[in-house]
């Protein structure tokens, strides 16, 4: 393969099952000199952008994307791509947000930490999740639906 | 209305080269998407011979279409499929596809109606 | 190499049967697996993307589901229109192993 631009990497904080009313953020990963990240769920006519970008290591930028109260509809699948002028990148491979209800019992963790998809793993075998269309970003109203979008 | 129409389909001997264009309207290829080729010998099945990334230029290929094939995007709205080597084998109705701009995964939505290739002496 | 292996390559069912096509992968891929119809000198048309989701203005009657690697279509109430052969495939396109691969197609004939 000849790769111009280095696949992102996605991964969520504290992990990818979240309880019902938690938080959660999407880590979106890439090369230095990223302009705009995107998160994309499930297609890229679902997504959010941010320039909010840092500087996570010499040779790395990275951006954050939070959901301050997660519901059901958040659960499904999530990528990240971003743009280094003059070109947008590939996308990662997908995260899949679990959302599940509190039991509070102590034997049952309430996140799977470390969770992370990009270009050096497999795309994850999560079953895939029926879902409404969903929000994400930093609350429900930041949803955008788009058509054309680059 | 968004199209894709491939070009350069042609009856040519053994061992010759030939190259393939894909034509796109209606979109851009900016927005990165990926752009297939896959093939159809007469009477047989679909065999994907690889992709590239129209924003990024990442190309993939099948094992068995490296070195012989390669794929470019020569323009915003071109994308070739340069042939070597070919055989009577290579025979085939060559589509270009694009990935969905509305459906998540990657699945091949938009289609070009094909061009035939035909590799006799 | 990844190899989507499709069965059966023929089926032959009366007007409103139900026919299942099954597509095994040779590995992992999770839901990077969509379905096509092709008619003769057509070319194909997507039904089914993401394993599972119906692609817009596709029937009801076609339905996807997965079982770990083995993947499955499923045509119910067959009509005389759904004669044609049905393609699986895997469009994942990365770096830990190279998708794109096709079953062989399923003809799917009606009586």
């Known amino acids: 393969q000849e790769e111009d631009l280095p696949r992102p990497s996605i991964s969520a904080e504290p992990g990818t099952v979240i309880p019902l009313g938690s938080h959660v953020t999407f880590v979106c990963r890439g090369p230095v000199g990223v302009q705009t990240f995107r998160l994309e769920r499930e297609s890229r006519s679902t997504y959010n952008d941010t320039e909010d970008v840092s500087q996570a290591s010499p040779s790395e930028s990275e951006a954050r994307f939070r959901i301050d109260s997660v519901s059901e509809g958040n659960a499904g699948p999530y990528r990240c791509i971003y743009y280094k002028p003059p070109k947008w990148s590939e996308q990662s491979d997908y995260l899949e947000l679990l959302v599940k209800e509190t039991s509070g019992g102590p034997d049952s963790p309430d996140t799977e930490p470390g969770s992370s998809a990009g270009p050096t793993q497999r795309p994850s075998d999560n079953s895939h999740n029926e879902h409404a269309p969903a929000s994400q970003g930093l609350k429900a109203e930041h949803l955008y639906h788009h058509h054309h979008h680059h | 209305e968004q199209s894709l129409e491939e070009s350069g389909g042609d009856l040519v001997k053994p061992g010759a080269s030939l190259t393939l264009a894909c034509t796109a309207s209606?979109?851009?290829?900016?927005?990165?998407?990926?752009m297939c080729w896959v093939r159809q010998a007469p009477g047989k099945g679909l065999e994907w011979i690889g992709c590239?990334?129209?924003?990024?230029?990442?190309i993939y290929y099948a094992s068995w279409a490296k070195g012989r094939f390669t794929i470019s995007k020569t323009s915003s709205t071109m994308v070739t499929l340069q042939m070597s080597s070919l055989t009577a084998a290579d025979t085939a109705t060559y589509f270009c596809?694009?990935?969905?701009?509305?459906?998540?995964?990657?699945?091949?939505?938009?289609w070009g109606p094909g061009t035939l290739v035909t590799i006799s002496s | 190499e990844l190899v989507m292996t499709q069965t059966p390559a023929s089926v032959s069912e009366a007007v409103g049967g139900t026919v299942t096509i099954k597509c095994q992968a040779s590995?992992?891929?999770?839901?990077?697996l969509a379905w096509y119809q092709q008619k003769p000198g057509q070319r194909p048309k997507l039904l089914i993307y993401?394993?599972?989701s119906l692609a817009s203005g596709v029937s009801s009657r076609f339905r996807g589901s997965r079982s770990g690697t083995e993947y499955t279509l499923t045509i119910t109430d067959l009509e005389c229109d759904d004669a044609a052969t049905y393609y699986c495939q895997c469009t994942y396109y990365g770096t830990t192993y190279i998708g794109g691969a096709f079953g062989g197609g399923t003809e799917v004939e009606i009586k």
């Open positions: 993401a394993a599972s």
């Open positions: 596809a694009r990935d969905s701009e509305s459906y998540g995964y990657n699945p091949c939505e938009l």
């Open positions: 590239i990334h129209s924003s990024s230029g990442s």
């Open positions: 209606g979109f851009s290829f900016s927005d990165g998407y990926y």
């Open positions: 590995q992992t891929i999770s839901n990077y």
